[in-house]
Every structure is written in C-alpha cells, then in structure tokens.
Amino acid sequence: EPTMYGEILSPNYPQAYPSEVEKSWDIEVPEGYGIHLYFTHLDIELSENCAYDSVQIISGDTEEGRLCGQRSSNNPHSPIVEEFQVPYNKLQVIFKSDFSNEERFTGFAAYYVATDINECTDFVDVPCSHFCNNFIGGYFCSCPPEYFLHDDMKNCGVNCSGDVFTALIGEIASPNYPKPYPENSRCEYQIRLEKGFQVVVTLRREDFDVEAADSAGNCLDSLVFVAGDRQFGPYCGHGFPGPLNIETKSNALDIIFQTDLTGQKKGWKLRYHGDPMPCPKEDTPNSVWEPAKAKYVFRDVVKITCLDGFEVVEGRVGATSFYSTCQSNGKWSNSKLKCQPVDCGIPESIENGKVEDPESTLFGSVIRYTCEEPYYYMENGGGGEYHCAGNGSWVNEVLGPELPKCVPVCGVPREPFEEKQRIIGGSDADIKNFPWQVFFDNPWAGGALINEYWVLTAAHVVEGNREPTMYVGSTSVQTSRLAKSKMLTPEHVFIHPGWKLLEVPEGRTNFDNDIALVRLKDPVKMGPTVSPICLPGTSSDYNLMDGDLGLISGWGRTEKRDRAVRLKAARLPVAPLRKCKEVKVEKPTADAEAYVFTPNMICAGGEKGMDSCKGDSGGAFAVQDPNDKTKFYAAGLVSWGPQCGTYGLYTRVKNYVDWIMKTMQENSTPRED
C-alpha cells in the first residue's frame, strides 16, 4: 500500500552489514505525489564506481544514483548527508555487498517522504494545452472563454463540430474567421444534400491561410474533404493549394479541420452548392441520343433510338428505341440496353426452290434463292437475292419482302422429238419429247399439263366423267408401267360454258368450245418426264397460218391397233378449214351438212396420212413459240375429225386464253397466290 513516509535501514544497522547480501526496498507514495529520499548516515565500503558494495536508487528504468563510502552533512542544522527528489510516486532502493570487507562498515540510514509535485512546472511536457492548475497531490487543466475541455481532461478546443448543412447553397468558415483559428481543435462539418445532387466546393486562394507543412511536407494544421471513399487534401499553407472548384461526385461531404497547439493563422472560408449529379455522355454504339447535349445531369431523360438495322431485344420481342434517365447516383438507367443488329432469322423455304444456308442472319446479310432448274424458274423476278433489312425482314430490291415464286418452265421438252421410222402415219415418241402429255384412262384420251395444278383437255373427254383418273410421266400406258408413273387426282372439272351438253353425246355434230380444265388436288412435281406446255400469247404473233407445223402426241388409235400402248407422235401442218369440211365423214351419225365448223377450230393434217385419231382427244397440238424457239405452246387441242388419217380439227386455244386465266385465277388456292 502506498505510504506518505518511511524509513530504510541497511541490514543489521547500526551494526556492520554482512557480506554477500542483496536487499531491495520498493517505495510507493500515493498518486500525484513525488518522493523525497534522504540519507542521514552513509558508511559503505568505497570502491571505484561503487563496484564492491553499494546502495542504488532506481526510478523506473533510470538510475537516480549509486552510493558508497562515508558521507557527512555539510549543513550543521541538517543531518542529511545525501538526498534525492523524484517527481514520480515509485522508487526502488537496492543494497548490495560483496564477499569481503576490509573494515567494519555500518551501512546506511535513509528516510522518504511524499512531497507534492507541481505537474504544471516540473515536467518538460506541459500536461495542459492551455491553463494548468496545481494542487497538493494533483493538478487540473482549464480553458479560456469559448473553449471547452476535451474528454482527456487535458486539451482544450473550440466547439466547432456537429453542424449539418442541407441547403443547396451555403458558406462555411473556420472558427473566428478571419481572426486566428483556435489551436488544438478538430472541427467537423457535414454537408448532406438530396440524392441526385453533388456537392461542389469553391474556394479563393486568398481566403485560405493555415499553418504551413513541416520540413517533411506534413501539414501541422490541415483541412480535409471526404466524400464517400474519395478524399481531397489534406491542405495547408498560405493560399489554397488545391483546385479552386472541387466536384465531389457525392451528395454527402465531410469537412475536417484539424489544428495543433501552435500557430496563429486566419484560417479559411469556402462556399458550396449542390449541382445536379452529372451522368457521363456515353458512347452507345449504333444509336442516336435525343436531345443531344454537351452535358447531362440528374433527372435528364434521353430517348435512345437504334440506327436502322439495329434493335433492343428482350426475349422474343424487340424495340427500336428506349428511354434512359440520369439517376441520382450519376449513372444512366437502362444502361444495359444495347442496340444490336436486327436478326432476320432463318429465311423461309420456298416450293420448288432452295435458299443457301446463310453465313449470318443479321442486318445487312445477303441470301440467294434459286429455283430447281431447268424445270422451274423465278416467276416474279428480282433475281432471288435478298438482304436482311432494318425491319427484320429479308427484302428483295424488286419484290420487297415477298418471297420468290418458282414456277414450272413451260414448253421445253427434255429431249426434242425426232421422227424416226415411219409407223403408219406417225412415229414412236418418248414422254421426254412431250412431258406435258397427260393420259386419261376413262375415256381413253389425252390432255396437256399447263401448270402444277391444271390440266387442259377437250370438253368431250370429261363431260361423261367428272372425276377422271390421269397419269403423267410415262411413255407406256401398260398397267404395270402406269403403276410406276404419277397418278393425278382431280379436284374439280371446269367445262367451257359454251360447250353444249347433250343427252346422247354420241350423236354430236357441234364440237364448238371443246375445251375443259381439270383442277388437281395436289401440285405436280416437275422433272424430265413431267413439265407443262405453254399457253399461246394473245398477240397476233400467235395467229396460225396455213402450213405452220405442229406436233401431236397420244396413245390413240393407229392403223394397226385400236389403242397404242407406247406414245406416238406426228408433225403436221395447219390447213385451211375448208380442207376439213371437204373430207367425207367416215361413220356419219347425221347429215354431213349438220357438222359445225367455227373460227374456234383449227384444221391440220392431210400430209402423208398423219393425223390424230380416237383416243388422242384432248392432247395438245404443240407449235413452236414464235417469240422463243426453244419453247412449244398449245395452239390446239385434239377435238374431232371427219376421218382418221386425213384432216383433224383442233380447238383453237388462243381464243380461250382469257377464260383459262380467269378460271384458274378464280379457283386458285392460297398456296398458289
């Protein structure tokens, strides 16, 4: 326990102290007191540096003294031979003796007392920043007016913290500005603005005078700005050394002014204001901003419009523009949205044609459609080249988004017909010479394919059977061969309205308007053995002249057989209608004068006995196209005749082109449109 005083005596005092002894005493007086230690007797073996025997006085880590030898008082009124005054409340005294003494030494007598210390003057480091007040056993610090004592009870500072500025504009200065600012203070000011506004601080150089930095460049007094994780400063010196305009990019700013114990400067003054938070003018590819401004700030809204061919995609839908707002955090809303190239997707396939696999389906990509040549061609032009347009469609320069239409090439046989060995007025033919040739099995007759869905034939062929079975693509009409050919199923039969229907068709003498159309259920696939014949044009170029040659084909009666199994064909000239009138009807069912001849009929034949006959009805009389020698068109249809092997009469197709076109148009399917 601490004591106010005490006595310390060497071992056996006042007798001689023993050899080889070490003894220590720990002196402690109450806090706030120092120790006065004094010796009234000292008789210890003398040696250099008191190396043999000694009494040692230690304060903390410091040796206050080491004594040996004999001492006597210099003052007759005082018994004190040696004394120590320490401003601390603890002291250690250590006595040591070695193994031998030359003489008999009596040791020492010492006393200690607690003494008051003046903390205000006794120490190098002054304990108080301002006023120090000593009292017995302690001290207290006090402060000048307008200062307050910090919690450490030693330092005084001014009460300059806790202010929160929320106005959009304001002024802040150091305490007492422009008079010298208080020393030993830490002033904190907070600026807190509405989200979306950044604090902008402005200073003038001349409004700043703060104690300069030391030789190492460290500010002794300093002004610091802290905005979130960004710090501006510390600043000190004469004249503001930082930027005169500080954009903090934050709505919250802490201003910290720290001063030390020295220096007398006027301090600082600043202004601040809230600027709407700026948003960066971003470079968003493939788009335009509206309105275009040099600077965008909080609450500004821009419309971002994608350039042609670009869009913003969300799932399966897209948009060509969107809005973006400059937000309170200085960032744009919808910054994730990017204008990407429009994707036109996999191009649609087309009937009887193909499209090459595109390398890309994005805006600007090019694809090419082709038709299955040589049997189909692109009817609606445009060349088949499409590019991916800005609206996400594949677009052709001519057709726009409309797809190309591959339609059958007409009137071009894969192999030309060559008259070989004469076989009773005709020659054997191959279906490749007449790929348009259609076979009707009931009645045994013919027809001509004019496109994927339509067969042209004679009215008298279909008047008795409105659901005829037809075949294409086979040279032979043997049952076994027909099984391998393509059978066509009719959907509807259209007989020309001018064809007179009779109760007893066998007695017919009027074959005017002997023409009919059969609409097929399914489209016919074209190839080397199946392809259509052209229709005549409506111009005068397609008016037949006497002597013009045409080809007929069919499986009708020959000189040897009632029906041919293999296709026969013949080339014959157009003749004047009177030639047909002059021929006597072989088996008349009426008076010769009763037979009707009209301009809707073509007379042809009369050469080398080549003629069409029973079973060839409805087949085409094919004539070379005057405007394209590679093609044949159906100038006539086998209709009737006075006598096989002479002249025959053919329905003049040119006179029916309008009816054919109208009928096909009115009865087409969406697939054909």
């Epitope: 609450r299 809204v301 839908v317 523009s321 809005y323 707002t325 937000q327 994730k336 949205l337």
Partner: antibody, heavy 116, light 107 residues
C-alpha cells in the same frame, strides 16, 4: 426456361427486418435489372427499387430510402431484398421481376406479415 | 415522382364487349408505358409494352395506344379469361410508378 423462384412467407414483429430471396434460372441475372415490387392486401403495385447485378448499382424509391437494401449474388444467380424497421403497413406480397425493356418475368411473390 | 392515374377504378362488362381503360401520367412519359394484367393470387403478366406493342403470346384482342400523358388499353371482345385487374406503369424515369389499377368484373 426463365423462372424466378422466391423464398417462403415470413411473419415478423414491428421493428424487425426481413430478407427475401429471388433465385433466377434460365438466364444470367448479370444481363438484366432485377426489380422489387410490393403489393399490400387489396392494393395496387408499388415499385421499390432495382439492382444491376453486374456492378451492384442500385436505385431505390424515395419512400423506401434508408430502409431497403437490394443486393445480388451473381455466383448463385440470386437477388435479395431486405427491408428494415418493419411496421404493420409493410404487410404485403413482395415480388421480384426481371427487366431490360419491361417487366417480362415475375417471381411468384412472398407474403411478409408484420404483426406484434 | 410521376403519378399515374387510371380510370375507371372498376368496370363491369359482359363477354364479347369492347372495353377501354385509360391511364394518365402527371407529366410527359413519351411512349414509355406498359400494361399488365393481374388475376387474384397470381403475379402480374405483361400485355403491352412501349404503349402499343403487344407482348409475344398476348391475344390480338388486346391493343394499346397513346403517347405523352394519355394512354388507353382496349380489349376488342372480352373473353371469360380477361376478367382481372389491369395496371399501367411508366418506365420513362425512376421511380417507375404504377397506376392504382382497374378491376374488370363480369356484369
């Protein structure tokens, strides 16, 4: 396919906090904004705020500022909404929603009941 | 904040009727307006985005129009499954605000 699955219903006392999760599948949340919308019983929809999970940027409606915290864990493809200092009027169904151009996909909703 | 006001608050109609719901914004939102449908116990579903574009899978009887401050949602011929609450929402600027809703009921 795209799905947002939210955590289950919660009952909380006034003053407490609640944290609702929204697990996304079928897409990467870093490529979208994740929003939170609430709907009090028999009331309309109320937008609370959003997060851009790519950079953790958030925007909150002024009404919830200081009480709501929206976070995202891109490693688990999950968004979270925490609402603190709960009061009885915070009783609502809380929805998460995904957007770029619009709120195309929504979670099934999480009922939070605040009752003493 | 932008206020969105829907009218009417509720509406009774019959199957086959043509119905129009309006939404008014307190300030110009250009075409940044979406329409949602919500049925009891379900999450909202997007119908129309950017004022007039039908979202994929939404029947063609739903259409949207308007720009600036006045918008309409039209259902050309009501079907039984259309009875629900409809909300408009502006996405022009944050905070994204919703209308208070229009409840469509069977007459």
């Amino acid at each position: 396919q795209v799905q947002l699955v939210q955590s289950g219903a919660e009952v909380k006392k006034p003053g407490a906090s609640v944290k609702v999760s929204c697990k996304a599948s079928g897409f990467n949340i870093k490529e979208y904004y994740m929003h939170w919308v609430r709907q009090a019983p028999e009331q309309g929809l109320e937008w609370m705020g959003w997060i851009d999970p790519e950079n953790a940027d958030t925007i909150y409606a002024q009404k919830f500022q200081g009480r709501v915290t929206i976070t995202a864990d891109t490693s688990t493809n999950t968004a979270y909404m925490e609402l603190s200092s709960l009061r009885s009027e915070d009783t609502a169904v809380y929805y998460c929603a995904r957007s770029r151009l619009f709120f195309a996909y929504w979670g099934q909703g999480t009922l939070v009941t605040v009752s003493s | 904040d932008i206020q969105m006001t829907q009218s009417p608050k509720s509406l009774s109609a019959s199957v086959g009727d043509r119905v129009t719901i309006t939404c008014r914004a307190s300030q110009d939102v250009r075409t940044a307006l979406d329409w949602y449908q919500q049925k009891p116990g379900q999450s909202p579903k997007l119908l129309i985005y950017s004022a007039s574009y039908r979202y994929s899978g939404v029947p063609s009887r739903f259409s949207g129009s308007g720009s600036g401050t006045d918008f309409t949602l039209t259902i050309s011929s009501l079907q039984p499954e259309d009875f629900a609450t409809y909300y408009c929402q502006q996405q022009y600027t944050t905070p994204y605000t919703f209308g208070q809703g229009t409840k469509l009921e069977i007459k």
